[in-house]
Amino acid sequence: TIDTKRNISAEEGGSVILQCHFSSDTAEVTQVDWKQQDQLLAIYSVDLGWHVASVFSDRVVPGPSLGLTFQSLTMNDTGEYFCTYHTYPGGIYKGRIFLKVQESSDDRNGLAQFQTAPLG
């Protein structure tokens, strides 16, 4: 089975760890695919190790373990993320994470101060 935090949040400009945990008494992991919606983020395989898709190579760092660290987050990164575990002989298991990227606290504070500042 796949165990993961269903919903996570992080600040714009910050980073977040995407993590799925696979547990099985018999099956061994042979490959893990990570996707942002339908777009490939990175792949790990026992044979080849990690490959980060070129589109994300400046913002995605493999690990910890079979997870990913996603850096320099933008509001556009809000959405669904999927891990797909290819196992032998168990088959394919999928996990889903929803990431909400929020405005940084600095931005929120700045906006609040601006809104409450007296005119003139």
Partner: antibody, heavy 118, light 107 residues
């Protein structure tokens, strides 16, 4: 530098057999799935067969199933395609290709021409 | 089997033109879509993998987009060495299948 070098092509009569080889160098051959793809003269690309890194799993196009056998010898860094009961429609340039993560074909050999004709 | 339909089958363009080639899958293939360039007498060369990732060493004028069933290869400014035939290919399931190709010719 990654290199794939096919050999074994040639002229064969219908019903005959050929064995193609693909010698790999410049990478850890035993870590990659390998595929064969063919291209008939003046036509597009057609996938033929695939084999996983360990050789434990293979798959074939319906058009060659039961006639062609893909295999590999990781100790020799070599991929093979045994072609039996050849038909005129098997005439093509045959390419071997490296396939990381079973996803994309990132390096191809130069191809070897197989001509099936009486 | 998943059918891959490419359009147009051929096009004429000039150096400097922006060229767009489309590929449609007969069912959803997520982002399991790759693009290749082939010149006469040569083996295909990988340009774009996973729908939008540029293969190492490929010029940045090539880009890919799309997911599901509809995909696009764009050459932002056509160069003399780009006149060739381009193929899309799905790796969502076996048998792997290729589009019929798009031949880019000099106008």
């Amino acid at each position: 530098e990654v290199q794939l070098l096919e050999s074994g092509g040639g002229l064969v009569q219908p019903g005959g057999s050929l064995r193609l080889s693909c010698a790999a160098s410049g990478f850890t051959f035993s870590s990659y799935s390998m595929h064969w793809v063919r291209q008939a003269p003046g036509k597009g690309l057609e996938w033929v067969a695939a084999i996983k890194s360990s050789g434990s799993s293979t798959s074939y196009a319906d058009s060659v199933k039961g006639r062609f056998t893909i295999s590999r010898d990781n100790s020799k860094n070599t991929l093979y395609l045994q072609m039996n009961s050849l038909r005129a429609e098997d005439t093509a340039v045959y390419y071997c290709a490296r396939v990381p993560y079973d996803y994309w074909l990132d390096y191809w050999g130069q191809g070897t021409l197989v001509t099936v004709s009486s | 089997d998943i059918q891959m339909t490419q359009s147009p089958s051929s096009l004429s363009a000039s150096v400097g033109d922006r060229v767009t080639i489309t590929c449609r899958a007969s069912q959803s293939i997520s982002s399991y879509l790759n693009w290749y360039q082939q010149k006469p007498g040569k083996a295909p060369k990988l340009l774009i993998y996973a729908a939008s990732s540029l293969q190492s060493g490929v010029p940045s004028r090539f880009s890919g987009s799309g997911s599901g069933t509809d995909f696009t290869l764009t050459i932002s400014s056509l160069q003399p060495e780009d006149f060739a035939t381009y193929y899309c290919q799905q790796s969502y399931s076996t048998p792997l299948t290729f589009g019929g190709g798009t031949k880019v010719e000099i106008k």
